[in-house]
């Protein structure tokens, strides 16, 4: 039977009596940073080739033994899961190997640093296919270090590193922390996040997803036919790396945004038991398990959308929050949320010649994430129409009035501390899918898109009174671009996507003694492309 | 993830850029700046990478390196340039005492000196 | 689930030699470091000795060294301390310890056996 | 001799806080990771806090962590008569290259 990892992260449709997908990855190659490795191990022999690469620190220790195996233990491990010929994620993918991890399993930033500049050196003399870099490391949080990954990623190389093994917000490690990377967490055969004794797999915003990272089967270096089974977020994001060989050898011309968005997209959703995640991180943490697509090719017809949660703004006064999306990802929507409930709102704004998304902290506030839906929308022009607060009448109302654009967000801001004492609003009227309604306190901002075959509806779901949490999902076929709550009153916490599900948290009404007037909408806008439908269609 | 105006956790040592008594003094009023890592038992003191200005070319950052070595000599400070960072990133790795950082914060094109630190396999 | 359970405790005449073993469960064994701490009657806690996961590094509290030593069998999941030359002043419960993790062995010591106490008296 | 230094004890009434701070140097406390151990009469010590302030799941978030310079200190808020016991700091000396532990503090709640 095959081992457990290997069946979690396969469709179904590809189950049999061993893991065979269709292309292993034959296009792409697959940089390995980590320690020495075995490379006349049977299971990666002829797979991986040992760069003459190697800047490592001194071992620790005054009687330290320098022992072969030992010292190839990590790496080889890690070249087998992603292209081992009886136990590997990407059988076909070709490897190369870095030595910055010694035989401790230690390194430096400077060594790593030096070998992304070896690859991104070999990536101009000699231009191949396709690269994945998987950096199964980490260390505390690195400036440099995140900006020679954001560099590489930018020449077109996809990064996929560990989140760390040591139950914190991997923001606070890197390469974990870098934007452009993809950071992988760990969850084992029952779906939950991975214990490595008092510690465990990290989590938070700076995780990307997680996938298979204890008890995994995978070459030893004890002997050239041995195996073995280790833990942790390496194991993890060498899964990653190797679906991500498999779907570039597919999709060869993929940018690393598209593939972070199908990442994303074809993983197992809501299957990871949040409760083991600190409460304040649960929000925050993607409960996504990676796994391979149905079919390698024509996911293209997709409307792909992801949610990126900003840094927390801090408790001061006039803190804000900043949301960005990737270069390639448009800024579809932007919400915001505060665990107090005292923010004031949230707009998008343009900085350096892109869109982004920004919350702001009200007085008393402990502080507010802004929450951006970055989506790829090939050939979209996209505007944000604002409407000053309204004051008299009785809400705020912004429409797309450009012919041909359409409603994919809707944000509001207040400069008044607490939209609470103020009367609300009452539900907007329907039949109006290209307008966004909000307080008469506040000013209103409406995301405009054009974009070939893009097209767009509202779906909203009020209770009478807020009782914790509002939902409201898109239907299958539809992708979830917006997600904002009305009315925008004091008891609401805010408004964020979950996967394709808008999510509107309030106060119970139990601790707020709010009256039933106070009605909480979850309004979602839901998008199409039937311009990318038509287009793949076309291709097959 | 994170984010350049994120709400990490470091040391950030900002020093206001002055002439001492350079050719190319950098900019007045821009601020090179001092990372290192948070976790103590990680960080190496004694090895710093000096990131440059995005557009620097590999010969100003070797001219920035010696200019460095030139300077530390003259207080009498022994330094070692590691290793001459292009293609990612310009900037060099450089062996010294931490005492040299204020003057190496002021050198033309630099943006910011981070000390090395440890990473670990996961 | 997680235990360590210590064992070879009791009484020896001083210039003697004892073995202690601690016997792990619920665990991977071999992923983690592993620590033998002592305290003596009314006294704190004194560390012994350190052995990395893999068996590759030792470390020894100067008290102890050069008489003490620490070894492990993964297959066995078995922790020893092998003590030689003892003293009066080694007189002690002895705890073995799990280390917070395998590479990061400084961070301290998460599990902890009951205690086997070694009692070295003429 | 232990190269960390804590009050011998430290008393407050039920409901209180107390804190119990550790003394070191550079070539520990200064940098290198701090945990916190707890005694309770006639058992093994039992992990608090490890990497300065964290703390193990099953530790309540009455018990804190902190780290100022060559210094560190753990605090316990709403005091309970089951807090009585001994707390030891440890951390590795980069010097001695070994672990260390702190003199211990017995806590009494009156």
């Known amino acids: 039977s095959i081992p457990w990892n290997l069946e979690r992260i396969t469709p179904p449709r590809y189950r049999a009596d061993e893991y065979q997908p269709p292309d292993g990855g034959s296009l792409v190659e697959v940089y390995l940073l980590d320690t020495s490795i075995q490379s006349d191990h049977r299971e990666i022999e002829g797979r991986v080739m040992v760069t003459d690469f190697e800047n490592v620190p001194e071992e620790d220790g005054t009687r330290f033994h320098r022992q072969a195996s030992k010292c190839d233990s990590h790496g080889t491990h890690l070249a087998g899961v992603v292209s081992g010929r009886d136990a590997g994620v990407a059988k076909g993918a070709s490897m190369r190997s870095l030595r910055v991890l010694n035989c401790q399993g230690k390194g430096t930033v400077s060594g790593t640093l030096i070998g992304l500049e070896f690859i991104r050196k070999s990536q101009l003399v000699q231009p191949v296919g396709p690269l994945v870099v998987l950096l199964p490391l980490a260390g505390g949080y690195s400036r440099v270090l995140n900006a020679a990954c954001q560099r590489l990623a930018r020449a077109g190389v996809v990064l996929v590193t560990a989140a760390g093994n040591f139950r914190d917000d991997a923001c606070l490690y890197s390469p974990a922390s870098a934007p452009e990377v993809i950071t992988v967490g760990a969850t084992n055969a029952q779906d939950q996040p991975v214990t490595l004794g008092t510690l465990g797999t990290n989590f938070g915003r700076c995780v990307d997803l997680f996938a298979p990272g204890e008890d995994i089967i995978g070459a030893s270096s004890d002997c050239s036919t041995c195996f073995v089974s280790q833990s942790g977020t390496s194991q993890a994001a060498a899964h990653v790396a190797g679906i991500a060989a498999m779907m570039l050898s597919a999709e060869p011309e993929l940018t690393l945004a598209e593939l972070r968005q199908r990442l994303i997209h074809f993983s197992a959703k809501d299957v990871i038991n949040e409760a083991w995640f600190p409460e304040d991180q649960r929000v925050l943490t993607p409960n996504l398990v990676a796994a391979l697509p149905p079919s390698t090719h024509g996911a293209g017809w997709q409307l792909f959308c992801r949610t990126v949660w900003s840094a927390h703004s801090g408790p001061t006064r006039m803190a804000t929050a900043i949301a960005r999306c990737a270069p390639d990802e448009e800024l579809l929507s932007c919400s915001s949320f505060s665990r107090s409930g005292k923010r004031r709102g949230e707009r998008m704004e343009a900085q350096g010649g892109k869109l982004v998304c920004r919350a702001h902290n009200a007085f008393g506030g402990e502080g507010v994430y802004a929450i951006a839906r970055c989506c790829l929308l090939p050939q979209a022009n996209c505007s944000v129409h604002t409407a000053p607060p309204a004051e008299a009448s009785m809400g705020t109302r912004v429409h797309c009035h450009q012919q041909g654009h359409v409603l994919t967000g809707c944000s509001s801001h207040w400069e008044v501390e607490d939209l609470g004492t103020h009367k609300p609003p009452v539900l907007r009227p329907r039949g109006q899918p290209n307008q966004c309604v909000g307080h008469r306190e506040a000013s209103i901002h409406a995301s405009c898109c054009h974009a070939p075959g893009l097209e767009c509806k509202v779906k909203e779901h009020g209770i009478p009174a807020p009782q914790g949490q509002v939902t409201v999902a898109c239907e299958e076929g539809w992708t979830l671009t917006g997600c904002s709550a009305l009315p925008g009153t004091s008891h609401v916490l805010g408004a964020y996507a979950v996967d394709n599900t808008c999510v509107v948290r309030s106060r119970d009404v139990s601790t707020t003694g709010s009256t039933s007037e106070e009605a909480v909408t979850a309004v979602a806008i839901c998008c199409r492309s039937r311009h990318l439908a038509q287009a793949s269609q076309e291709l097959q | 993830q994170e984010d350049e105006d994120g709400d990490y956790e470091e040391l950030v040592l900002a020093l206001r850029s002055e002439e001492d008594g350079l050719a190319e003094a950098p900019e007045h009023g821009t601020t090179a700046t001092f990372h290192r890592c948070a976790k103590d038992p990680w960080r190496l003191p004694g090895t710093y990478v000096v990131v440059l200005k995005e557009e620097t070319h590999l010969s100003q950052s070797e001219r920035t390196a010696r200019r460095l070595q030139a300077q530390a000599a003259r207080r009498g400070y022994l330094t070692k340039i590691l290793h001459v960072f292009h293609g990612l990133l310009p900037g060099f790795l450089v062996k010294m005492s931490g005492d040299l950082l204020e003057l190496a914060l002021k050198l033309p094109h630099v943006d910011y000196i981070e000390e090395d630190s440890s990473v670990f396999a996961q | 689930q997680v235990q360590l359970v210590e064992s070879g405790g009791g009484v020896v005449q001083p210039g003697r030699s004892l073995r202690l073993s601690c016997a792990a469960s619920g665990f991977t064994f071999s992923s983690f470091g592993m620590h033998w701490v002592r305290q003596a009657p009314g006294k704190g806690l004194e560390w012994v000795a350190l052995?990395?996961?893999?068996?590759?590094?030792?470390y020894y509290a100067d008290s102890v060294k050069g008489r003490f030593t620490i070894s492990r069998d993964n297959s066995k999941n078995t922790l020893y301390l092998q003590m030689n030359s003892l003293r009066a002043e080694d007189t002690a419960v002895y705890y073995c310890?799990?280390?917070?993790?395998?590479?990061?062995?400084?961070?301290?010591?998460?599990?902890w056996g009951h205690g086997t106490t070694v009692t070295v008296s003429s | 001799q232990s190269v960390l230094t804590q009050p011998p004890s430290v008393s407050a009434a039920p409901g209180q806080k107390v804190t119990i701070s550790c003394s070191g140097s550079s070539s520990n406390i200064g940098n290198n990771f701090v945990s916190w151990y707890q005694q309770l009469p006639g058992t093994a010590p039992k992990l608090l806090i490890y990497d300065y302030n964290k703390r193990p799941s099953g530790i309540p978030d009455r018990f804190s962590g902190s780290k100022s310079g060559t210094s560190a200190t753990l605090g316990i808020t709403g005091l309970q008569t089951g807090d009585e016991a001994d707390y030891y700091c440890g951390t590795w000396d980069s010097s001695l290259s070994g672990y260390v532990f702190g003199t211990g503090t017995r806590v009494t709640v009156l």
């Open positions: 310890a799990r280390a917070i993790a395998a590479l990061y062995y400084y961070y301290g010591m998460d599990v």
């Open positions: 052995i990395w996961n893999d068996g590759s590094n030792k």
